[in-house]
Interface confidence: medium
């Protein structure tokens, strides 16, 4: 997953400690798991469990690892090349259009509807009308602020910055 980059994600730069491996940049870029030194001569490894980088880069800083919020479980820890993967706890889900928090799944469908999809970490239960079979979200859909329609991509149970 190619998760990029917020101002808060930038880890404070520290002088390379002896345990931080150094290598030379390739075409001015450093490999995943590293960032470039200020003079551009070295690639400095990220610190395991503290920060990471996921792609070839000329970042002056590795990116700070995400800490899972309360209400989330950690699926996989932060490594030097991948951010922490967090997932909503059982019974809650994270919607693509409100990714900052886990929301409780509904416990049942409205009258006249039947459940056709279970609560998952990335979707609420899915209800359809008994007769017509049309889907119902249980809420008035919010007007999405979009640029254009674009090919859809499925939600995945992963940290937003990982």
């Amino acid at each position: 997953e190619s998760a990029l980059i917020t101002q808060q994600d930038l880890a404070p730069q520290q002088r390379a400690a002896p345990q931080q491996k150094r290598s030379s940049p390739s075409e001015g870029l450093c490999p995943p798991g590293h960032h470039i030194s200020e003079d551009g001569r070295d690639c400095i490894s990220c610190k395991y469990g503290q920060d990471y980088s996921t792609h070839w880069n000329d970042l002056l800083f590795c990116l700070r690892c995400t800490r899972c919020d309360s209400g989330e479980v950690e699926l996989s820890p932060c490594t030097t090349t991948r951010n922490t993967v967090c997932q909503c706890e059982e019974g809650t889900f994270r919607e693509e259009d409100s990714p900052e928090m886990c929301r409780k799944c509904r416990t049942g469908c409205p009258r006249g509807m039947v459940k056709v999809g279970d609560c998952t970490p990335w979707s609420d239960i899915e209800c359809v009308h008994k007769e017509s079979g049309t889907k119902h979200s249980g809420e008035v859909p919010a007007v999405e602020e979009t640029v254009t329609s674009s090919p859809g991509t499925p939600a995945s149970p992963c940290s937003l910055s990982g």
Epitope: E1, T6, L10, L60, T153
Partner: nanobody, 125 residues
Framework: EVQLLESGGGEVQPGGSLRLSCAAS????????MGWFRQAPGKEREFVSA????????YYAESVKGRFTISRDNAKNTLYLQMSSLRAEDTAVYYC??????????????????WGQGTLVTVKP
């Protein structure tokens, strides 16, 4: 509402160059992460490159490292992608994306960032 308009796509021979532009309107881009993704026919959308504002630097997919260069002009509210040594496998629709908030990262499959309509790049002899 944020509007993104890509331009600069077209047909080019292998080894050729193109420069894509993405003009943003509706807000200043200076404090927001921006990037480029692409989608080849019959394939999933994939990350190409991303730009961090001010000091941070840039990210590149391994497949474009050393051939593509991302840059931005905050005064013009525009993101660029200079593509050189183009290959047939670079053929795709290229999409510009900008983060929804300063705290929002740009992700490959999630995040509901703002997307442009895309510009087609075709590399063929």
């Amino acid at each position: 509402e944020v509007q993104l308009l890509e331009s600069g796509g077209g047909e080019v021979q292998p080894g050729g160059s193109l420069r894509l532009s993405c003009a943003a309107s509706g807000r200043s881009i200076s404090n927001y992460a921006m990037g480029w993704f692409r989608q080849a026919p019959g394939k999933e959308r994939e990350f190409v490159s991303a730009s961090v504002w001010n000091q941070g630097g840039n990210y590149y997919a391994e497949s474009v490292k050393g051939r593509f260069t991302i840059s931005r002009d905050n005064a013009k509210n525009t993101l660029y992608l200079q593509m050189s040594s183009l290959r047939a496998e670079d053929t795709a629709v290229y999409y510009c994306v900008v983060a929804r908030t300063p705290e929002t990262p740009i992700t490959s499959a999630r995040g509901a960032n703002y997307w442009g309509q895309g510009t087609l790049v075709t590399v063929k002899p």
